[in-house]
């Protein structure tokens, strides 16, 4: 079921080999998976209450964002 | 509206099958990943499974792993929880749940689980 | 497996007390704590995710704070709404574990 040897060293640490292209790194498995069907509703900032505008975002721009970004929820995945 | 409606609890013997449904509302379904989790009577909350957005990948609690099997129908919407080899440890009200992710760069974080079917118990009794 | 302890196992509020919960994890577990209200009868409802984000529609009244091992949801002033079983979840790695649950109850 596993997608292969590439993973991080532990929760917090970089990446040493980023997933290939159209992949993400799920922290909860450990392993990279499909980054298909991203439909992302914006956060919000902690403690806030009122719901969060939507929005889409493809999937080349995800895997392409910086990992220094703000965490975007994120439907599907797993 | 987001929702998860649950069928197939029952009762049965143990040593016996029982199939559990979950039907989302709408076509967001497609795109979730899932859980199965259950609550035995008076006791703590206990995660059985999880399964991907198209069903590629699956894992399962240790106390059902071998018996039970998660899988999906994305073109009817549907979470399947298939329970095999009862036991009456497995008596329990199971809730459905729709896996909550962010997207970090190119790092998913989980957070839980937000949206929740309204529960089937399953007794297994002789 | 990492344990979630959770504490009180149970507890007495009056309407518009200050309440605080604690979940200790066996290891460290970064912000990868959710919290969840349940009442007789009903499924869990999310209220905190990542330990300190609030989800949407939930009152501000509802807090939660704290990394690693230790973690506290605080309910700021208690409503009559409030008193159910509340449980925090970790979600850094499978097996994905629950607390035992903190029943909040009327005095």
């Known amino acids: 079921m596993r997608r292969g040897p590439r993973s991080l060293r532990g929760r917090d640490a970089p990446a040493p080999t980023p997933c290939v292209p159209a992949e993400c790194f799920d922290l909860l498995v450990r392993h990279c998976v499909a980054c298909g069907l991203l439909r992302t509703p914006r956060p919000k900032p902690a403690g806030a209450s009122s719901p969060a505008p939507r929005t889409a975002l493809q999937p080349q721009e995800s895997v392409g964002a910086g990992a220094g970004e703000a965490a975007l929820p994120l439907p599907g995945l797993l | 509206e987001v929702q998860l409606v649950q069928s197939g609890g029952g009762v049965v013997q143990p040593g016996r099958s029982l199939r559990l449904s979950c039907a989302a509302s709408?076509?967001?379904?497609?795109?979730?990943?899932m859980h199965w989790v259950r609550q035995a009577p008076g006791k703590c909350l206990e995660w059985v499974a999880v399964?991907?957005?198209?069903?590629?990948?699956?894992y399962y609690g240790d106390s059902v792993k071998g018996r039970f099997t998660i899988s999906r129908d994305n073109s009817k919407n549907t979470l399947y929880l298939q329970m095999n080899s009862l036991r009456d440890e497995d008596t329990a009200v199971y809730y459905c749940?729709?896996?909550?992710?962010?997207?970090?760069?190119?790092?998913?974080?989980?957070?839980?689980?937000?949206?929740w079917g309204q529960g089937t118990t399953v007794t297994v009794s002789s | 497996e990492i344990v979630l302890t959770q504490s009180p196992s149970s507890l007495s509020a009056s309407v518009g007390d200050r309440v605080t919960i604690t979940c200790r994890a066996s290891?460290?577990?970064?912000?990868?704590l959710n919290w969840y209200q349940q009442k007789p009868g009903k499924a869990p409802k999310l209220l905190i995710y990542?330990?300190?984000s609030l989800q949407s529609g939930v009152p501000s009244r509802f807090s939660g704070s704290g990394s690693g091992t230790d973690f506290t949801l605080t309910i700021s002033s208690l409503q009559p709404e409030d008193f159910a079983t509340y449980y925090c979840?970790?979600?850094?790695?499978?097996?994905?574990?629950f607390g035992c649950g903190t029943k909040v109850e009327i005095k």
């Open positions: 749940a729709r896996r909550f992710t962010h997207l970090r760069g190119w790092i998913i974080e989980d957070y839980g689980m937000d949206v």
């Open positions: 709408g076509e967001w379904f497609s795109s979730y990943g």
């Open positions: 399964i991907w957005y198209d069903g590629s990948n699956k």
């Open positions: 290891q460290s577990i970064s912000s990868y």
């Open positions: 990542a330990a300190s």
């Open positions: 979840q970790q979600s850094y790695s499978t097996p994905l574990t």
